[in-house]
Interface confidence: low
């Protein structure tokens, strides 16, 4: 049945998919408090533009009975379960805010009719890449294949002098689900990362990695995982590591490694961390006052739906456009809007663009130091420290394999 | 100017093996990955398989035990040979360049080796 | 392995007509749904790709459209230069696979 949207004569309404099942273990009330602070921005802001109009948002919670897992795995039904509970409400917004997880926002594409544009907090997965109406706004797993492509093709930097072309990937099946998505995306036979490698194993055991370390018959010095540094302590203990092992860490949304006490442990000496380069304002705001740092970009990002959706509706409003056209549903993309935090690019199909960072550990201070950076956006990398500190003989990465001449 | 040129025997004996070399032009292989694909009247297109542009292969389950794709990035040529042939491997064999991640299309193809496997 | 199928295997219009090429996949392809011409000299040309994209240098009577499982070709108004075979090519996963191929002739 068609459902009408709460979306004109100057009312406009948000739909904020309440899930039990998200991609990150967020109480919901901060949620709410993120998208409520969002409100009150964006009515601001309108009302700056001489918009006299109302916005308000619609919480939408699932029962919470059937759904109950608390993580993504029994996500798909409860998206189509909560779109169905708003059909019967015959009551939608001009946006839908949420779901965040893979499965979920793939089968509510999949099954509705999408004449509104969907935000999400997450949805990380290769399957929904593309999706004309969708905006994601956490870095999806695409754009972190393209980083590492990029990485690994690089050899003319004076830290890094070889091209690569191979990888071990560790995915043991009880990642997060950032990090389920960034693994499963590089274990995929069909993705960018699989297609531009020589060789790419995967390591599925803890003891397959144990093993690595040292093997001198290993087909590749290079090993991605995904977790914190607590997570790789766990796993590799104090054990001894070759030499030429680099380990690439991908800790996204993260930003303890910014913080000013903060000392690396001597285990992260062989490490490389991939991390995305710290907000300023956020540590101050109201709603993030009682978040983890991993957690503190899950709100943001539904903080920063609410504003992209109030910068479309600004645009829209002011050009005396209707916001309850296929127009508008596609407009959420290959854009810049004002975010909490400073500017946000969303690229052509409507993914967040970022500046990812490359961490290394310092002999010399046993800080974490920025080793580069890389633009997501322009798919460029910028190289911050020409003489790092590295635990690597003279201090440059080595090769991928060992035994490998200059190329 | 992108282009593949295809070079290879006309006519193979059965049981032996089929050569053909693919030489690119325009484009690097460093870059794309080159596709083989054949056309028979009685199976139409098969796809048989792919050398991507970091080395690494992956070739049609139907066709793996006899199939071995390479390539010599710097001469710019891409090697296919199939094995133990018979009667009805007589096609069209055609080489093709990959598109443009994440799409999965042959973005530009050879003009095919027409070859026939008889005694 | 995903099965694509063309159940028109010939198709006769006339010039200045509407042609309408149909693909059938196995099972929902997400929109990974190319399109080629062959001519009969056997050559072969991308004309569109991910259902609705339209190669470079493609003329603007060529279009696409489908999701889930159909798909079609559209040449919106036919010229002699379009007699040839259409091929559509699954690229959701491998290994890929071809549709049977229609042949277009004019009356």
């Known amino acids: 049945s068609q459902v009408s949207q709460n979306c004109h004569n100057g009312s406009y309404e948000i739909s904020v998919l309440m899930m039990g099942n998200s991609a990150f273990a967020e109480p919901l009330k901060n949620l709410e408090d993120a998208v409520n602070e969002g409100l009150e921005i964006v009515r601001g802001r309108l009302q700056n533009a001489g918009l006299n109009v109302t916005v308000n948002a619609t919480f939408m919670y699932s029962d919470g009975l059937i759904h109950n897992s608390g993580d993504c795995r029994s996500s798909t039904c409860e998206g189509l379960d909560l779109l169905r509970k708003i059909s019967n409400a015959q009551r939608m917004g001009c946006v839908l805010i949420g779901p965040s997880c893979t499965y979920s926002t793939f089968q509510m594409y999949l099954d509705t009719e999408l004449s509104y544009p969907m935000i999400s907090a997450g949805s990380f997965g290769l399957s929904c890449d593309y999706k004309e109406t969708l905006t994601r706004l956490m870095s999806p797993a695409r754009k972190l294949m393209y980083f590492l492509v990029n990485f690994w093709k690089t050899n003319d930097l004076p830290f890094k002098t070889y091209s690569w072309s191979t990888s071990y990937v560790y995915k043991n099946g009880t990642e997060t689900e950032d990090c389920f998505w960034y693994l499963n995306a590089l274990e995929a036979s069909v993705s960018y990362f699989s297609h531009e490698l020589g060789f790419k194993v995967v390591l599925r055991q803890d003891k397959e990695f144990q093993d690595i370390l040292m093997d001198h018959n290993r087909k590749s010095n290079v090993i991605i995982m995904c977790g914190g540094p607590e997570f790789l302590y766990k796993l590799k203990g104090d054990r001894a590591v070759a030499e030429d092992i680099v380990i690439i860490l991908v800790d996204l949304f993260n930003d303890q490694y910014f913080e000013d006490n903060v000392t690396a442990p001597d285990y992260m000496k062989n490490v490389l961390v991939l991390t995305l380069s710290p907000g300023n304002s956020l540590l101050n705001s109201s709603f993030s006052r009682n978040l983890s740092p991993t957690k503190r970009d899950f709100a943001l990002a539904y903080l920063n739906g609410i504003l992209l959706f109030g910068h479309m509706l600004k645009i829209f409003l002011e050009n005396g456009e209707n916001i309850t056209t296929p127009k508008f549903a596609h407009a959420f993309r290959n854009l810049t809007f004002e975010g909490y935090d400073g500017p946000v690019t969303l690229d052509d199909w409507g993914d967040v663009d970022s500046t990812m960072v490359l961490l290394y550990t310092s002999v010399d201070t046993k800080k974490y130091k920025v080793l580069l950076t890389y633009d997501t956006h322009v798919n460029k990398t910028y190289p911050v420290d020409m003489s790092p500190t590295f635990t690597w003989k003279n201090s440059k990465l080595p090769n991928d394999i060992t035994g490998r001449g200059p190329q | 100017q992108v282009q593949l040129k295809q070079s290879g025997p006309g006519l193979v004996q059965p049981s032996q093996s089929l050569s053909i070399t693919c030489t690119v032009s325009?484009?690097?292989?460093?870059?794309?990955?080159v596709h083989w694909v054949r056309q028979s009247p009685g199976k139409g297109l098969e796809w048989l398989g792919v050398?991507?542009?970091?080395?690494?292969?992956d070739y049609n389950a139907a066709f793996i035990s006899r199939l071995n794709i390479t390539k010599d990035n710097s001469k710019s040529q891409v090697f296919f040979t199939m094995n133990s042939l018979h009667s009805d491997d007589t096609a069209i064999y055609y080489c093709a360049r990959h598109g443009t991640y994440p799409y999965w299309y042959f973005a530009l193809w050879g003009a095919g080796t027409s070859v026939t496997i008889s005694s | 392995d995903i099965q694509m199928t063309q159940t028109t295997s010939s198709l006769s219009a006339s010039l200045g007509d509407r042609v309408t090429i149909s693909c059938r996949a196995s099972q929902d392809i997400s929109n990974y749904l190319n399109w080629y011409q062959q001519k009969p000299d056997g050559t072969f040309k991308l004309l569109v790709y991910?259902?609705?994209r339209l190669q470079s240098g493609v003329p603007s009577r060529f279009s696409g459209s489908g999701s889930g499982t159909l798909y079609s070709l559209t040449i919106s108004t036919l010229e002699q230069e379009d007699v040839a075979t259409y091929f559509c090519?699954?690229?959701?996963?491998?290994?890929?696979?071809f549709g049977g191929g229609t042949r277009l002739e004019i009356k």
């Open positions: 050398i991507w542009s970091g080395g690494r292969k």
């Open positions: 090519q699954q690229g959701k996963t491998l290994p890929f696979s």
């Open positions: 991910y259902t609705s």
């Open positions: 325009g484009f690097s292989l460093t870059n794309y990955g």
